[in-house]
Interface confidence: low
C-alpha cells in the first residue's frame, strides 16, 4: 500500500460528555484490514488499552462501565494492518460532569427580555473556579468563558447578549471547572429559560426566578446534584 494508512475515526456513545457513574463506550473505526486497535490516553502510559477488532474487523469497542475522574481526558486511537500502524485518529475529549457542586445560573436584569434589549446570563459558583461553560439546549456549540489569566479566582462568569433576538430564547445551563483539568466539569446548573418577547406590550410570565443583584461567593448555596444533558455539547477551547 502506498503512503500512510488512513487515520481511524474515534467517537463515544452516548456522547463525549458523561456524568459520573454512567457508562460510556469508545469506538475506533479503521479499515477491514485492521488486525488490532490501540487506544492512547494523553498523559497515561501507552497503550491505554488494546482490543481485537469486531467483525467485520473495521472497528473496535473500548468500554468504560462507570465514568470516574480517571477516565476523563483526551484520547486517540490507532489500528494495525499487515503493513503497519495507522496515523492517529483525531482526538476525542471525554469530559466528566459531576466533579463539583453545581453553579447557579441567573439572568440580569431578568429572564424575561424584550427583543432588541440586553441581558446577561450569570453563572456563579460558591468556590473559585477557572472556567465556566454555558450551553443552550439543542444548540450545536456551547458558549464558553475561558479560564482567565488574571491574578484572581473567578466565582462567576458573565455571558452578555446584546441585542437580544428571538434566537436567544431557550433553555440554558452552565457548568464550572478548574483550569488544571478541562475534562472535569461540575454538575449542571438548574435550567434557566430565557424568554424573548416581541414588545413591552406583550410580556409573558417568567418560569424562573431572577437574581437582580449580584451576591458574593459566600452567599451562594451549595446545591444538590442534577441531571446532565448529553446531546449537542462539544468542547471548544480557544
Amino acid at each position: 500500500q502506498a503512503g500512510p494508512l488512513p487515520k481511524p475515526t474515534l467517537w463515544a456513545e452516548p456522547g463525549s460528555v458523561i456524568s459520573w457513574g454512567n457508562s460510556v463506550t469508545i469506538w475506533c473505526q479503521g479499515t477491514l484490514e485492521a488486525r488490532e486497535y490501540r487506544l492512547d490516553k494523553e498523559e497515561s502510559p501507552a497503550p491505554w488499552d488494546r482490543q481485537n477488532p469486531l467483525e467485520p474487523k473495521n472497528k473496535a469497542r473500548f468500554s468504560i462501565p462507570s465514568m470516574t475522574e480517571d477516565y476523563a481526558g483526551r484520547y486517540r486511537c490507532y489500528y494495525r494492518s499487515p503493513v503497519g500502524w495507522s496515523q492517529p485518529s483525531d482526538p476525542l475529549e471525554l469530559v466528566m460532569t459531576g466533579a463539583y457542586s453545581k453553579p447557579t445560573l441567573s439572568a440580569l436584569p431578568s429572564p424575561l427580555v424584550t427583543s432588541g434589549k440586553s441581558v446577561t446570563l450569570l453563572c456563579q459558583s460558591r468556590s473559585p473556579m477557572d472556567t465556566f461553560l454555558l450551553i443552550k439546549e439543542r444548540a450545536a456549540h456551547p458558549l464558553l468563558h475561558l479560564r482567565s489569566e488574571h491574578g484572581a479566582q473567578q466565582h462567576q462568569a458573565e455571558f452578555p447578549m446584546s441585542p437580544v433576538t428571538s434566537v436567544h430564547g431557550g433553555t440554558y445551563r452552565c457548568f464550572s471547572s478548574h483550569g488544571f483539568s478541562h475534562y472535569l466539569l461540575s454538575h449542571p446548573s438548574d435550567p434557566l429559560e430565557l424568554i424573548v418577547s416581541g414588545s413591552l406590550e406583550d410580556p409573558r410570565p417568567s418560569p424562573t426566578r431572577s437574581v437582580s443583584t449580584a451576591a458574593g461567593p459566600e452567599d451562594q448555596p451549595l446545591m444538590p446534584t442534577g441531571s446532565v444533558p448529553h446531546s449537542g455539547l462539544r468542547r471548544h477551547w480557544e
Epitope: 440580569l108 450569570l122 468556590s127 473559585p128 468563558h145 475561558l146 482567565s148 489569566e149 488574571h150 491574578g151 484572581a152 479566582q153 473567578q154 466565582h155 462567576q156 462568569a157 458573565e158 452578555p160 478548574h178 488544571f180 449580584a214 458574593g216 461567593p217 459566600e218 480557544e238
Partner: antibody, heavy 121, light 112 residues
Framework: QIQLVQSGPELKKPGETVKISCKAS????????MNWVKQAPGKGLKWMGW????????TYADDFKGRFAFSLETSASTAYLQINNLKNEDMATYFC??????????????WGAGTTVTVSS | DVVMTQTPLSLPVSLGDQASISCRSS???????????LHWYLQKPGQSPKLLIY???NRFSGVPDRFSGSGSGTDFTLKISRVEAEDLGVYFC?????????FGGGTKLEIK
C-alpha cells in the same frame, strides 16, 4: 475588617534567603488570588505574579522565575514570598495584594502595607 | 509585555484646580471577554497603593466623585475636578488585561 498584614522589615546579606509572610483576615482566604508586587526604592511598581489560594498553583512573571517562590499556609490564611540567593537588585518593598476585578458586578481590592527588604554586605 | 506610558511625569497644581493624567498602552487593553482592565491607583509616601478607579471608569468604594476615569483601547485619562491636599501623591495606571500585569511609571501630583 478586611486586611493583609505583612511581616516586618528584613536586613539580609547577598546570597542569603528571605521569606516574607502575608496574613489575611476578614475574608475567606481561599476565595481570592494573592498577587505579589515589587517596588524598588524611588521606582514604580512591578507585578511579580500570583498564587491561586484555592489550588496552590503559582504563576510567575518572566523576571521572577527561578529564585522566587510563592507558597501558602492555608490553615493560617497566610501567603509567603521566598527569595533565594539574594542580590542587590532585590532590595525593595514587596507588597502582597488580593485583587478581584473579573466582572462588573462586584469588586475586591486589598493590599498589605509592604515589607522592606534591604540587601547589604 | 504591555508598556504603560504615563504623562506627565510631574504635575504641579494649585488646590482647587483640575488635574488630568494620561496613560497610553502599547497594545489594546480590551480583553477577549469584552472588559477593559485599566485601573488607577494613588500611592502616598510610605503607604501601599490605594485603588481609585477600576476598569477605566468605575470608582472604587469610598473614592470621592471628583475622581473620574475615561478612555478606551489604548488611551486613558484620569481627571481630578478639584484637587484637594489629600490628593497629593503618585498616581499609577495599571493594566491586568494581559499577563504580566504592568504599571505606568507614575505621575507625581504636587503643589505648584
Amino acid at each position: 475588617q478586611i486586611q493583609l498584614v505583612q511581616s516586618g522589615p528584613e536586613l539580609k546579606k547577598p546570597g542569603e534567603t528571605v521569606k516574607i509572610s502575608c496574613k489575611a483576615s476578614g475574608y475567606t482566604f481561599t476565595n481570592y488570588g494573592m498577587n505579589w508586587v515589587k517596588q524598588a526604592p524611588g521606582k514604580g511598581l512591578k507585578w511579580m505574579g500570583w498564587i491561586n489560594t484555592y489550588t496552590g498553583e503559582p504563576t510567575y512573571a518572566d523576571d521572577f522565575k527561578g529564585r522566587f517562590a510563592f507558597s501558602l499556609e492555608t490553615s493560617a490564611s497566610t501567603a509567603y514570598l521566598q527569595i533565594n540567593n539574594l542580590k542587590n537588585e532585590d532590595m525593595a518593598t514587596y507588597f502582597c495584594a488580593s485583587i478581584y476585578y473579573h466582572t462588573s458586578l462586584w469588586y475586591f481590592d486589598v493590599w498589605g502595607a509592604g515589607t522592606t527588604v534591604t540587601v547589604s554586605s | 509585555d504591555v508598556v504603560m506610558t504615563q504623562t506627565p511625569l510631574s504635575l504641579p497644581v494649585s488646590l482647587g484646580d483640575q488635574a488630568s493624567i494620561s496613560c497610553r498602552s502599547s497594545q489594546s487593553l480590551v480583553h477577549s471577554n469584552g472588559n477593559t482592565y485599566l485601573h488607577w491607583y494613588l500611592q502616598k509616601p510610605g503607604q501601599s497603593p490605594k485603588l481609585l478607579i477600576y476598569k477605566v471608569s468605575n470608582r472604587f468604594s469610598g473614592v470621592p466623585d471628583r475622581f473620574s476615569g475615561s478612555g478606551s483601547g489604548t488611551d486613558f485619562t484620569l481627571k481630578i475636578s478639584r484637587v484637594e491636599a489629600e490628593d497629593l501623591g503618585v498616581y499609577f495606571c495599571s493594566q491586568s488585561t494581559h499577563v504580566p500585569y504592568t504599571f505606568g511609571g507614575g505621575t507625581k501630583l504636587e503643589i505648584k
